[in-house]
């Protein structure tokens, strides 16, 4: 799978994580920081 950094318009898309662009799937993906979950890393869990 080809990946690259997200475009600058997606700054802020991942609330608590890193945004990755999955080129072949035409979608952005959030790699969440430890303790966060959700499509956009918006949920905190203990």
């Amino acid at each position: 799978v080809s990946i690259t950094k997200c475009n600058s318009d997606m700054n802020g898309y991942c609330l608590h994580g890193q945004c990755i662009y999955l080129v072949d799937m035409s979608q952005n993906y959030c790699r969440c920081e430890v303790g966060y979950t959700g499509v956009r890393c918006e949920h905190f869990y203990l």
Partner: antibody
Framework: QDQLVQSGAEVKKPGASVKVSCKAS????????IQWVRQAPGQGLEWMGR????????KYQEKFEGRVTITADTSTNTAYMELSSLRSEDTAVYYC?????????WGQGTLVTVSS | DIQMTQSPSSLSASVGDRVTITCKAS??????IAWYQQKPGQAPRLLIQ???TLQPGVPSRFSGSGSGTDYTFTISSLQPEDIATYYC????????FGGGTKVEIK
Amino acid sequence: QDQLVQSGAEVKKPGASVKVSCKASGFNIKDTYIQWVRQAPGQGLEWMGRIDPLTGQTKYQEKFEGRVTITADTSTNTAYMELSSLRSEDTAVYYCVRSGTSFDFWGQGTLVTVSS
Amino acid sequence: DIQMTQSPSSLSASVGDRVTITCKASQDIHKYIAWYQQKPGQAPRLLIQYTSTLQPGVPSRFSGSGSGTDYTFTISSLQPEDIATYYCLQYDNLRTFGGGTKVEIK
């Protein structure tokens, strides 16, 4: 399957406002950005602005700043685009477009006619 | 705002011809360009995103290339069903469409 269903055609008088809705099904708009694009008859595509429904943050094209308001109601999974002080040049098909979780998934379009 | 200059605005070519459309951005858009096809009365159809990634179901005669500020869209062998208007879209920093290229059969 995923859908963006827009409100029906509108006819408005110059100076009035119009509010177009865009209801999502099959996905949560909080996971996406919702963009708005318009196309006047026989003209090209024009990006108007977008909203992040999760945070409420909006970005607008300079040309429309102060005249367009994009909002979202996450409880009904619906985005809205309101354009005020309408003039004849605003006659166009208005599209909502999902981006983020996938690349650019379009609604069916809403024709807004501005005529006295 | 980033400006996208698309050329030509229209072209006429014969079936089987190679057709090339270019888009020039006012600044580096880091390959974040998409190409759309639009036929009369229809919503735009995405053909290519991230410069050269063909969408599922799109014929291989369509291709894209470029980097920095200069990008190219090519139809290797024009078919009658390719008659449409084509638009580039930069999506690196907000969004800007090119002015469109109307493709007709000679």
